[in-house]
Structure formats: C-alpha cells, structure tokens
C-alpha cells in the first residue's frame, strides 16, 4: 500500500535512495499501473529528483492530472526531451 | 557519494571523431538518467544527449546523426562518440548523471577542433 512506501520511505530519510528502495519504488509502481497523483506526491516529497530519473517514455504514462503533484524544484534536473513530455501533461492539467 | 570523471578531451581536426568517456564511482544504482552536456567560451552550458535506465536515449538537434551516448555497465563507463566534428563543437564537455534521484556532476573536459 501507499502507507507502507511512505513508512519505508521514512525510515530512509535523509539517506541517499539505496538500490532496494529503488526497486522497490520501481515495482509498487508497475503494480498501480501507473504513477498516480498521491505516488507522485510521495515520491517527490521525499526524492525531489525522481521524475528526471524517468525516460520520457516512462514521462509519457504519467497521467496530467498527477502532475498537480509536482513542483518547480522536482524539475531542476530534467534534461529538454523529459521536459518536452512534462510540459504539455502540466499544460492540460492546469486547463482542467 | 557517486563521483563522475570525464577523460579523452584534446584537439581534433575538423571532419574527424573523437570519443569522450565519463567513469561512474558506483555500479548500484537502479534508476538513472545518464547525460553529456556541453560549454563553449561565453555561452550557456548545452544538454547533448540521455540515456535512460530503460535503455533508451534522446539527442538535442544540433548533435543528432553526429553524436552517440552509450553506458557499458559492466565496466561503470559512460562514452560520448562524437563523428563529423566541427569548430563549433569546441567546449568543456561534462557528464551528469540522475541517478536514483539525485544529480551529479563531473569537473569536464576539454575538446577543441582545429586544424
């Protein structure tokens, strides 16, 4: 569940994202389908970077609504082709 | 903490290729976007080129059908194979990686094209 990641990911704080956290990430995430609002939220809450660790067609699945979750920061490190993903998904959220 | 550090900057004649190569400190990481970037003399540093944890990459239009990323994992290398050099390719050349989150530089290299 969600709670579960937030709790792990509390127990992490402050350290750098370990590779079993990393694949744990990766796998809650393949198990929802897709990366919702509220596991956008968490994630960023707690790794500001991880979007610009996605490829842009991993960007491409996220859905426009979760991008409410982000913030101008969790975009720092994104290179141009994730950006040219994210832009338009924040575009059309912000429209609805 | 994971340090990067580019190797393979020199002079290079015009029409020639050249190969740039950026050692990763650590082999652990899980989720990644690995990049080259790019500053010449008085301009903005430049995005080149990714590649993603997924296996796939992307180039900026200036270096497309020029350039060419690559990560050999085995040996902790990222490389920059550069082909069809020209002047205005001259610059401090550095690797950046996202890895697991978190963005990391490395100190650059210096490539100019000249004859």
């Known amino acids: 569940s969600l709670e579960t990641l937030k709790a792990l990911l509390e127990v992490n704080k402050g350290h750098e994202m370990s590779p079993q956290v990393a694949t744990l990430i990766d796998r809650f995430v393949k198990g929802r389908g897709q990366l919702d609002k509220d596991t956008l939220d968490t994630l960023t809450a707690f790794y500001p970077g991880y979007l610009c660790s996605l490829s842009p067609e991993e960007l491409s699945s996220v859905p426009p609504s979760s991008i409410w979750a982000v913030r101008p920061q969790d975009l720092d490190t994104c290179d141009p082709r994730q950006l040219d993903v994210l832009y338009p998904k924040a575009r059309l959220a912000f429209q609805n | 903490q994971l340090q990067l550090v580019e190797s393979g900057g020199g002079l290079v004649q015009p029409g020639g290729s050249h190969r740039l190569s950026c050692a990763v400190s650590v082999s652990t990481f899980t989720r990644y976007a690995m990049r080259w970037y790019r500053q010449a003399p008085g301009k903005e540093r430049e995005w080149l080129t990714s590649?993603?944890?997924?296996?796939?990459?992307a180039y900026a239009d200036s270096v497309k059908d020029r350039f060419t990323i690559s990560l050999d994992n085995a040996k902790n290398m990222l490389y920059l194979q550069m082909n069809s050099l020209k002047p205005e390719d001259t610059a401090v050349y550095y690797c950046?990686?996202?890895?697991?989150?978190?963005?990391?530089w490395g100190q650059g290299t210096q490539v100019t094209v000249a004859s």
């Open positions: 590649i993603y944890s997924d296996g796939s990459s």
């Open positions: 950046n990686a996202n890895v697991d989150s978190k963005a990391y």
